[in-house]
């Protein structure tokens, strides 16, 4: 809790906290945190988790307060909450805190992973699904083919991943992906590791079939040798004819 004096939720419901232009921004951007109360308030406070004293105050007789973070640095990223209060509530009494707003200030987002489902080797005519997975929700994911500047496919996703379907005939190739924020200022991830999709071609099938034949023949040779050794061993251990113990 922000203070020991937070009343039950039924008394003073929590406000809403949002960020403009976005919750993920590049360093140097001016960010406005907007705290909106469900009723007119007198004072608003912006809090960092674990701190009892507000980071910033705003004294406004309305339902909305704006907290300006100018030219943000990565150090200003993190969790924020806001509360509001009215003069008739008594000293130190604040509303329920808003839900946590996570502000991320970074030049680039972490590298996504790119994997093929069910695997990177495709049979003729079979489709393959590529999953580009990042760490953040509500991002735009973009799939690229090596040697081509424009995105092959793109997909906005509420999940921290997006799936792309490649048609079997066109699937083989080298792929990579990125994800980025869906609104300005656009923050782009690092590029994923490349993923090579290849044919399960007839050559490799013939090679595998050849190996199976060789293994089979080797097995037969081993069985034959085993039989000969056993036969020889039993011959040597059998008593010669005409000799009695």
């Amino acid at each position: 809790d922000i203070t020991p004096s937070v009343p039950p939720a039924s008394y003073h419901p929590k406000p809403w906290l949002g960020a403009q232009p976005a919750t993920v921004v590049t360093p140097g951007v001016n960010v406005t945190l907007r705290c909106r109360a469900p009723q007119p308030a007198w004072r608003f406070g912006l809090f960092k988790p674990g701190e009892i004293a507000p980071l910033l105050f705003r004294d406004v007789s309305s339902e909305l307060a704006e907290f300006f973070l100018e030219e943000v640095t990565p150090a200003q990223g993190g969790s924020y909450r806001c509360c509001y209060r009215r003069p008739d509530w008594g000293p130190g009494v604040w509303s329920q805190p808003s839900d946590v707003l996570e502000l991320l200030v970074t030049e680039e987002l972490p590298r996504p992973s790119l994997v093929a489902l069910p695997g990177p080797v495709v049979g003729p005519g079979a489709n393959v699904s590529l999953r580009c997975a990042g760490r953040l929700r509500n991002m735009s994911f973009v799939l690229y083919r090596e040697g081509v500047a424009a995105p092959l496919q793109y997909r906005h996703s509420a999940q921290p991943w997006a799936d792309f379907t490649l048609l079997g005939a066109r699937a083989p190739g080298t792929y990579s992906c990125y994800y980025h924020t869906p609104s300005a200022p656009y923050v782009l991830s690092q590029r994923s590791e490349v993923l090579v999709i290849s044919w399960e071609d007839s050559g490799s099938s013939d090679y595998t079939r050849g190996n199976l034949v060789r293994l089979g023949l080797a097995g037969l040779v081993l069985i034959s040798l085993g039989a000969l050794v056993t036969f020889d061993w039993r011959s040597q251990n059998r008593a010669p004819a005409g000799i009695r113990p």
Epitope: A149, R155, H156, Y178, Y186, V187, L188
Partner: antibody, heavy 128, light 108 residues
């Protein structure tokens, strides 16, 4: 003035080939996708595909993949839509439009604006 | 692919009235990637709104867009005679790009 000017109306027979054009002017042709949209008589809009004029790399709607070919010649700021063998069901109005290319750190990302300039449309009639 | 369903199919209103057009997506669409177009008979479509709520250049302020997730709305605050047309929503955040089926706003 920014504009996209499309080639004139065409009347063709089934099985014939056709190539229609869309010429951009008044802006940097390679800074925008060129998008092709079909509108069949009395129907809505359908995205056929888009081309990045920078390297003439085209993207197709699954419904139109293999049915049409989209190409571009950036030296004359022109994009093309072509059919190798027309069908009666290709009778429609075809529009080209532009959509801004967004780049971050030299990477082309998801388009972040709508189609802000449209050609006047090319009517294609296929009938025996 | 994301399917966009527009409602109503036809809206019969008088000049000066308020028009509210709905566009519902089969899956979540970021508001950054939703556009509205107007098309009059015999003309090419015209971009009205992009990013769900940003007016395109030269579009009068009687046109406004709102919404997020799967529900988006185009509002024309006071219909002018030139506003009677067909309106399409479109998402361009996931390939393939898709359009709604359109809403015709006609004079009552």
């Amino acid at each position: 003035e920014v504009q996209l000017v499309q080639s004139g109306a065409e009347v063709k027979k089934p099985g014939e080939s056709l190539k229609i054009s869309c010429k951009g002017s008044g802006y940097s042709f390679t800074s925008y996708w060129i998008v092709w949209v079909r509108q069949m008589p009395g129907k809505g809009l359908e995205w056929m595909g888009s081309i990045y004029p920078g390297d003439s790399d085209a993207r197709y709607s699954p419904s139109f993949q293999g049915q049409v070919t989209i190409s571009a010649d950036k030296s004359i700021s022109t994009a093309y839509l072509q059919w190798s063998s027309l069908k009666a069901s290709d009778t429609a109005m075809y529009y080209c439009a532009r959509q801004k290319i967004t780049m971050v750190r030299g990477v082309i990302i998801t388009p972040l604006d709508g189609m802000d300039v449209w050609g006047q449309g090319t009517t294609v009639t296929v009938s025996s | 692919e994301i399917v966009l369903t527009q409602s109503p199919g036809t809206l019969s209103l008088s000049p000066g009235e308020r028009a509210t057009l709905s566009c519902r997506a089969s899956q979540s669409v970021s508001s950054s990637y939703l556009a509205w177009y107007q098309q009059k008979p015999g003309q090419a479509p015209r971009l009205l709104i992009y990013g769900a709520s940003s007016r395109a250049t030269g579009i009068p302020d009687r046109f406004s867009g709102s919404g997020s997730g799967t529900d988006f709305t185009l509002t024309i605050s006071r219909l002018e005679p030139e506003d009677f047309a067909v309106y399409y929503c479109q998402q361009y955040g996931s390939s393939p790009l898709t359009f709604g089926g359109g809403t015709k706003v006609e004079i009552k």
